[in-house]
Interface confidence: low
Amino acid sequence: LQDPCSNCPAGTFCDNNRNQICSPCPPNSFSSAGGQRTCDICRQCKGVFRTRKECSSTSNAECDCTPGFHCLGAGCSMCEQDCKQGQELTKKGCKDCCFGTFNDQKRGICRPWTNCSLDGKSVLVNGTKERDVVCGPSPADLSPGASSVTPPAPAREPGHSPQ
């Protein structure tokens, strides 16, 4: 025997209290597939969340984040605070990148500057909190008249040793 509820389209639910009649989803609820026995409550975009797409009888609301925040998680389940370039988000808020590290995004973590000498190259442009070092040609490739910027030696983390 065919389940009578299978005839209920999206936007309705199969109401067992009313002889399995297809009833429209109540306000602020939806069913995105047919044959549902209940409608789901619409997501509400509150606080730091803002509505990107309104809820309809057949689809849930979609949220994004207010300016200064960005989405994390499936379907923007969380909003994480943006930081400025040159900062990273910590439990205590946005903190400037430590010397020798940078972040060129509004999200993510500060990354160490490139060590140009690892590839036998010289530093063409010093790193900043917002930008990585730019490596140039190896010192041997520079003509006698050419000059290169030499940054101060980067601070070493405890436990680091040359390989």
């Epitope: 994390l72 994480e80 020798g100 060129d104 995004q105 999200r107 993510g108 973590i109 990354r111 160490p112 500057w113 490139t114 060590n115 140009c116 690892l118 590839d119 790193g127 930008r131 990585d132 070092v133 730019v134 490596c135 980067p154 070493r156 983390e157 405890p158 436990g159 680091h160 040793s161 040359p162 390989q163």
Partner: antibody, heavy 116, light 111 residues
Framework: SRSLVESGGGLVQPGGSLRLSCTAS????????MQWVRQAPGKCLEYIGT???????YYASSARGRFTISRPSSKNTVDLQMNSLRAEDTAVYYC??????????WGQGTLVTVSS | DVVMTQSPSSVSASVGDRVTITCQAS??????LSWYQQKPGKAPKLLIY???NLASGVPSRFSGSGSGTDFTLTISDLEPGDAATYYC?????????????FGCGTKVEIK
């Protein structure tokens, strides 16, 4: 939509060379650290190297000398040039957006087979 | 190069169990560590970045902790879909050495 697609894989003889390309859609590749990783059949993931957003390159010691990572300025790609290939270089090669960011991305991989 | 040592190499657990995987770095990598899940024939999927941050779309059953040289991935309330191989990766590209290395994986099987 945003994606990474590797290309250039295939069969190559021992001692030969191959250039793999990774093309980005939906974002600018030069804004991110990009890495190449490989995986031999049934083996662990192996890091090859990274090109930073500033254009600087790091290599694993096992890749230094034979492999070169570059980012052609005219294209939204990152390339992996592989020379003096050996049978043990047979693997699936992946490019990936560095996972230090909260929105990572990996390509589907391209198979390189080194065999005579 | 930094060397990542992962353990155990495999673990068999039941649905609903808590599984803990550890990863040890040969040198101090602060919190520059990521955890990946890989299923056969698929590219790795990022679970955790910066040692303890949940990547986009990853269930909160997965959690990461640690800093310096010792790191842990915990899967609580194990589900059948969690059967996979899990890898740690150093993402520290330091002034003294190249990071990037992966551990050699932990295969999680469901009993």
């Amino acid at each position: 939509s945003r994606s990474l697609v590797e290309s250039g894989g295939g069969l190559v003889q021992p001692g030969g060379s191959l250039r793999l390309s990774c093309t980005a859609s939906g974002f600018t590749i030069s804004s991110y650290h990009m890495q190449w990783v490989r995986q031999a059949p049934g083996k662990c993931l192996e890091y090859i190297g990274t090109i930073s957003s500033g254009g600087n390159v790091y290599y694993a010691s096992s890749a230094r000398g034979r492999f070169t990572i570059s980012r052609p300025s005219s294209k939204n790609t990152v390339d992996l040039q592989m020379n003096s290939l050996r049978a043990e270089d047979t693997a699936v090669y992946y490019c990936a957006r560095d996972s230090g960011y909260s929105d990572p991305m990996w390509g589907q991989g391209t198979l390189v087979t080194v065999s005579s | 190069d930094v060397v990542m040592t992962q353990s155990p190499s495999s673990v068999s657990a039941s649905v609903g169990d808590r599984v803990t995987i550890t990863c040890q770095a040969s040198q101090n990598i602060r919190t520059y560590l990521s955890w990946y899940q890989q299923k056969p024939g698929k590219a790795p999927k990022l679970l955790i970045y910066a040692a303890a941050n949940l990547a986009s779309g990853v269930p909160s059953r997965f959690s990461g902790s640690g800093s310096g040289t010792d790191f842990t991935l915990t899967i609580s309330d194990l589900e059948p879909g969690d059967a996979a191989t899990y890898y740690c990766q150093s993402t520290y590209l330091g002034t003294d050495y190249v990071g990037g290395a992966f551990g050699c994986g932990t295969k999680v099987e469901i009993k």
